[in-house]
Structure formats: structure tokens, C-alpha cells
Interface confidence: low
């Protein structure tokens, strides 16, 4: 529908509260360094303007596009040049180039201070003093640190954040009530951000076709009773929603996501039997619930795939008539039969099938040529199965922390040029695959593990893209979205790497390590481990283990000492010397 005023249309559809929240998220995701107060001021100005357009859609400037209105507003920020440097040049451009320019300057790793959680009483006082400001601050802080966070989902997180404070600030033991809830929101939020980042990377780096293929596979696994026509409709609509959110069109995205949830619930009998509970919830919970809903049961009477896709004499005719539709049907039929496969594996199989048809449909005897195509799938299926089996065994043997350390060593040897903080962050997340997925039965392990690894490796890719230092990382990240994990798995030790100069300062520790949480202490030790491997890439597992065990003992000893600082200074020197000797540095 064409609306005289787009801003009035969205304000009416979304309501004032959601409108303001989404504009704040949009602005914070674009101008990540701007103070909270500045953003609130801009949002209030936009909201007041929107209200004038609701009152009279023909009023001045009400016919302008949202990009024009929001871009003009962002470009009024006085300190744009000083704070953002060349991003200020975006303001010299016209739409749509200006918005594209803002998008290109989104920073996945902004130089912002770590969010420190205040005391519970302090938070509760702030919450009671000004609930609205408190919740806006939450949206602002998350959005600026996660510039691709899925905006309608962030509204859902904010709703849960508010509920946690409403409940727990009245509880007898506020901390016992609130802190676990905040930890859960933080962990879920990081996971949600990373998953959405992969969707945006898929759309922006590999195009709409790649995203649609992913969506066909995932929705076909989730809704195996739905018809191909239905899955296609959902994929088209879902692609529009994510394209909008990834493009900064957050009002349209939230509006369209609500429409999609409404459609799914109105038509659940032709989509999935698992949607009933989701569809009884309020909008934000409903959309979240649908996105996470379990796979429906597979229809009992599904015929063999070979009949339509290998044995039929019409394969090449059907493929030639509508290539993407035919490949989409193949992907749909394969995925709905295989909830036990990862989405990326299903996409590899579809790619292999496509490559085979491209070759065989031009051959003298096409049927003879493609008759054995399904045999080519066997090694593709076995590779992730074997890898997951081996790594789950290793995880069960070592536990999460030591499994992470094994991955840290493995990945530092593969790509030692990558910055230490990035290697630590990515390897820690890769290591979490163990506790996340290895507990599942065989049938659920691969979709859990490989699709999670795709999300984590995308973090490596987007962080590396900001400051590229390794051709091997660039190659694995850019050649094929679905083969990223096999590409990284196949990397051996980088023989071209020149070991880093030894720097004693890197291995100097102080008494402040004793007051850190267990997680922070692990990160310190893992940072040291990466640095060790960078100094001595050929060090054996045994050598590294010996040094790390000594290091753990050293920290424990000095944290128990009366004069901790002296202990760290004196014992630290001995440890560095012993480590150098052990590693032959």
C-alpha cells in the first residue's frame, strides 16, 4: 500500500512506545559513540515530528522517506566529524547512498567500555526513580555494542529486562532473584546478536539467494508438513523482514515481522502442529516463540527422493524450466526428511546437486550422468558426523575450559596473525559447542553443532574484516558461506608464520587477577596461552600443558600469599624463566 506519509503509517502501526524504542535502537546502531542524552533528544524530536504527520499526513516533510528523515536528523549531530571521522562524509551524499554509507560504518567491535553491572540496590533505585529512562538506557547500551541486533527481538529482551526488575526489586533477596535473570538475558542476548549477525552477513556478503536457500532449508526442517508453496511464501516474507532489519529499516522490519507472525498463526493448520502455544502469546513473545519453535513431526508417508530428482526422465526439463524453483523443491524435500542434518550440510548437498545438473544436463546422456548423484552426498554427510564425534569425545574427556584451550591452540596455529583478543573470544565460543550440543542424542547433534559453529566462525569473519591480517581467514570467510567451517577445519599449521618476539611484559601478572571472577581469570590464562603459541607455534601439547599447569599453580599460590604483589613479581620472573626453558625460547 502506498501511504502519503511513511512515518505516520509506521507510527500508527507500531504505537508510540515501540516507535520510540525502535528509532532509539536505529540511531544507537548508527552513531555508536554518541552519548545517551543526545540520542534521546533526537528520538524525541523525530517522535514529535511523527505526531504532526499523524495529525496531518500532508504537512511539510511528512512525505519524505524514513531514510531521508532519519539521515537528516543524524546529520544534525554537531560533533559528527570529531567523533566519527570519515563517517561525517556520508552526510554529503543523497539517499540511498547516504544510508548505505552509514551502514558501511557500523562497527562490530566498537571501542566502548565494558558494561559493568552496578550493585543490585543501585540498579533497583535507578529503576524505581525513572523506569522509562532506565529501560531506554538498556536499549541504547545493547544497540550501540551490537549494531546488527535484531531490533524487534531487542524489544522482547527489554520487556523481559523490565519484568526482571519489576519482580526482583520487591523480593526479599533482590540479588538472588535478579542476578541469575540478568546473566540469562546477557548470555541469550549475545547468542541472539551473533545469530542475527550471520543472517545479515549472509544477505550482505552473499546475497538474497543465499539467505533464501538457508531459510528454505531451515523452515522445511521446522515445518515438514507444510507444502513447498507455503514454505516459499514464508521464506519470501522472512527474507523481506531480515533484509529490512539488516539494512537499518527497523520500523518496517518490526511491522512486517508482526504481520508475518499474524499470518503464521492464522494459517498454523497448514504450517505446523507445534505453533498453538506460541500463537496464544502477546506479540513480542509470539514472534520469539515462533522463531524458536521445535521441529514438527515428519509426515509418515514421504516417498523416496530419488523418484523425482534422479530416476525421473524429466529432471533436466524441470531444472531448465525454472532452475531456482526446482533446486528449492529439492532443498525443501531433502530438508524436511532430514532434521538430523545441519542447514549448512543441506546447502552443500543442494550445491552438489546443482553442480551435477549443470554438468549433466549438457551431456549426451544426462540420465546416465546424474544417476549416481546421491552417492556423492555420502562423504559430505560423513565429514561433519566424524568431526562432531571426535570433538564430543574430546570435550567429554577434557571438560569445557580445557576443551576451549585445545581449540585455542588449534586455531592459533592455523591463523596466528589474528589478534589475541579475537582468538580468545572466538575459541572460547567454539568451545561452548561441547556443553551446548554434545549432550544431545545423535539425531540432534549435527544441526546443533555445525549451525552453531557457523554463527561463531561468522564472528571471526566480521571481526577480521575490520582489520584483515590473514589471507587464510579472508579466503575461508569469502569463498563460500556454507563451506566456512570445513575450510577452517582443513587449515593446518601456518608454516609461513614468523614467531612473535618474546616479551616478558605479556607474561607479567599482578595481584588484581585474584579478585577477578572465575571467567575473567580463565580469559587471562587463555590470553597467555595464545601468546605462548604465537611465540612458539611448534610447541607440543605436552609442553604447553606443562607451562599452563605451572601458570595455574603460580596464580593460586600468589593469590593465597600475604604479600600478593611481591609474590607475583618474584614468582612471576621464575615462571617466565622456567617457561622459556621448557619451550626452548
Amino acid at each position: 500500500d502506498a501511504h502519503k506519509s511513511e512515518v505516520a503509517h509506521r507510527f500508527k502501526d507500531l504505537g508510540e512506545e515501540n516507535f520510540k524504542a525502535l528509532v532509539l535502537i536505529a540511531f544507537a546502531q548508527y552513531l555508536q559513540q554518541c552519548p545517551f542524552e543526545d540520542h534521546v533528544k533526537l528520538v524525541n524530536e523525530v517522535t514529535e515530528f511523527a505526531k504532526t504527520c499523524v495529525a496531518d499526513e500532508s504537512a511539510e516533510n511528512c512525505d519524505k522517506s524514513l531514510h531521508t528523515l532519519f539521515g537528516d536528523k543524524l546529520c544534525t549531530v554537531a560533533t559528527l566529524r570529531e567523533t566519527y571521522g570519515e563517517m561525517a562524509d556520508c552526510c554529503a551524499k543523497q539517499e540511498p547512498e547516504r544510508n548505505e554509507c552509514f551502514l558501511q560504518h557500523k562497527d562490530d567491535n566498537p571501542n566502548l567500555p565494558r558494561l559493568v553491572r552496578p550493585e543490585v540496590d543501585v540498579m533497583c533505585t535507578a529503576f524505581h526513580d525513572n523506569e522509562e529512562t532506565f529501560l531506554k538506557k538498556y536499549l541504547y547500551e545493547i544497540a550501540r555494542r551490537h549494531p546488527y541486533f535484531y531490533a524487534p527481538e531487542l524489544l522482547f529482551f527489554a520487556k523481559r529486562y523490565k519484568a526482571a526488575f519489576t519482580e526482583c526489586c520487591q523480593a526479599a533477596d533482590k540479588a538472588a532473584c535478579l542476578l541469575p535473570k540478568l546473566d540469562e538475558l546477557r548470555d541469550e542476548g549475545k547468542a541472539s546478536s551473533a545469530k542475527q549477525r550471520l543472517k545479515c552477513a549472509s544477505l550482505q556478503k552473499f546475497g538474497e539467494r543465499a539467505f533464501k536457500a538457508w531459510a528454505v532449508a531451515r523452515l522445511s526442517q521446522r515445518f515438514p508438513k507444510a507444502e513447498f508453496a507455503e514454505v516459499s511464501k514464508l521464506v519470501t516474507d522472512l527474507t523481506k523482514v531480515h533484509t529490512e532489519c539488516c539494512h537499518g529499516d527497523l520500523l518496517e522490519c518490526a511491522d512486517d515481522r508482526a504481520d508475518l507472525a499474524k499470518y503464521i498463526c492464522e494459517n498454523q493448520d497448514s504450517i505446523s502442529s507445534k505453533l498453538k502455544e506460541c500463537c496464544e502469546k502477546p506479540l513480542l513473545e509470539k514472534s520469539h516463540c515462533i522463531a524458536e519453535v521445535e521441529n514438527d513431526e515428519m509426515p509418515a508417508d514421504l516417498p523416496s527422493l530419488a523418484a523425482d530428482f534422479v530416476e525421473s526422465k524429466d529432471v533436466c526439463k524441470n531444472y531448465a524450466e525454472a532452475k531456482d524453483v526446482f533446486l528449492g523443491m529439492f532443498l525443501y524435500e531433502y530438508a524436511r526428511r532430514h532434521p538430523d542434518y545441519s542447514v549448512v550440510l543441506l546447502l552443500r548437498l543442494a550445491k552438489t546437486y546443482e553442480t551435477t545438473l549443470e554438468k549433466c544436463c549438457a551431456a549426451a546422456d544426462p540420465h546416465e550422468c546424474y544417476a549416481k548423484v546421491f552417492d556423492e552426498f555420502k562423504p559430505l554427510v560423513e565429514e561433519p558426523q566424524n568431526l562432531i564425534k571426535q570433538n564430543c569425545e574430546l570435550f567429554e574427556q577434557l571438560g569445557e575450559y580445557k576443551f576451549q584451550n585445545a581449540l585455542l591452540v588449534r586455531y592459533t596455529k592455523k591463523v596466528p596473525q589474528v589478534s589475541t583478543p579475537t582468538l580468545v573470544e572466538v575459541s572460547r565460543n567454539l568451545g561452548k559447542v561441547g556443553s551446548k550440543c554434545c549432550k544431545h542424542p545423535e539425531a540432534k547433534r549435527m544441526p546443533c553443532a555445525e549451525d552453531y559453529l557457523s554463527v561463531v566462525l561468522n564472528q571471526l569473519c566480521v571481526l577480521h574484516e575490520k582489520t584483515p591480517v590473514s589471507d587464510r581467514v579472508t579466503k575461508c570467510c569469502t569463498e563460500s558461506l556454507v563451506n566456512r567451517r570445513p575450510c577452517f577445519s582443513a587449515l593446518e599449521v601456518d608454516e609461513t608464520y614468523v614467531p612473535k618476539e618474546f616479551n616478558a611484559e605479556t607474561f607479567t601478572f599482578h595481584a588484581d587477577i585474584c579478585t577477578l571472577s572465575e571467567k575473567e581469570r580463565q580469559i587471562k590464562k587463555q590470553t597467555a596461552l595464545v601468546e605462548l603459541v604465537k611465540h612458539k607455534p611448534k610447541a607440543t601439547k605436552e609442553q604447553l600443558k606443562a607451562v599452563m599447569d605451572d601458570f595455574a599453580a603460580f596464580v593460586e599460590k600468589c593469590c593465597k600469599a600475604d604479600d600478593k604483589e611481591t609474590c607475583f613479581a618474584e614468582e612471576g620472573k621464575k615462571l617466565v624463566a622456567a617457561s622459556q626453558a621448557a619451550l626452548g625460547l
Epitope: 507444510a226 507444502e227 508453496a229 507455503e230 516459499s232 511464501k233 492464522e266 494459517n267 497448514s270
Partner: nanobody
């Protein structure tokens, strides 16, 4: 050329039956959700029934449930509407229409027939 052609309409007494046919050309009906839609004299369009591409999902408007039956013959590339226990309020022009992508209660159609008139009167 992609087109739909309805037939089978006519004058029938209340309580009587009719069978409408819709022949498709230029595409296969089994690849799409197919629909019957009607327009009573002086009224707007009213969706009547739909059958999904596999025939697994069949829907009816509440006003015709239990009286009308939608079906399809893939070999003849045709759609049918069996109408029993007809009432005066069923009087309308009946159109068959192709839904390009949706299953379930339809929202939009890309191909329409020219319609066939059904009159229920004593």
C-alpha cells in the same frame, strides 16, 4: 497463454446440486493452490474454497462448509466445485483463481477465469 475457463453454471432450484468445472491451460494446476471465489449481485467478492498444490490442505468458507466440495483432476488439468443443498444466497458469479504462492485462507490471486453464473431460485 496462461488462462482459466469456468463452465457448469446455470439455474437450479433450492436444495438442488451443480458441478462447476475450471479448465487450466499454460500451467499445471497441481503446482498451485487453486481457489473458487464468488460475487453475488451487487456485492463484493467472497472467497469460497481452496485446495493446496498437493491436495492435502482444503479449506471452505463457513457459509458453504458441509455443502460444497472442491477437487482437482491432475490428468485433465482441471479444478471442480461440487455444490449440493444449494440456497438462494448461493446465487453469484463463480470464478476460479490461481494463488501464486499461498496456502490457507487466500490473500491474492494472479490468474482469474471469466466466471460462470449460478442462479438458485424456485
Amino acid at each position: 497463454e496462461v488462462q482459466l475457463l469456468e463452465s457448469g453454471g446455470g439455474l437450479v432450484k433450492p436444495g438442488g446440486s451443480l458441478r462447476l468445472s475450471c479448465a487450466a491451460s499454460g500451467f499445471t494446476v497441481s503446482s498451485y493452490t487453486m481457489n473458487w471465489v464468488r460475487q453475488a449481485p451487487g456485492k463484493g467478492l467472497e472467497w469460497v474454497s481452496s485446495i493446496s498444490s498437493s491436495g492435502r490442505y482444503i479449506y471452505y468458507a463457513d457459509s458453504v462448509k458441509g455443502r460444497f466440495t472442491i477437487s482437482r483432476d491432475n490428468a485433465k488439468n482441471s479444478l471442480y466445485l461440487q455444490m449440493n443443498s444449494l440456497r438462494a444466497e448461493d446465487t453469484a458469479v463463480y470464478y476460479c483463481a490461481r494463488d501464486p504462492r499461498m496456502v490457507g485462507n487466500p490473500h491474492e490471486f494472479d490468474i482469474w477465469g471469466q466466471g460462470t453464473m449460478v442462479t438458485v431460485s424456485s
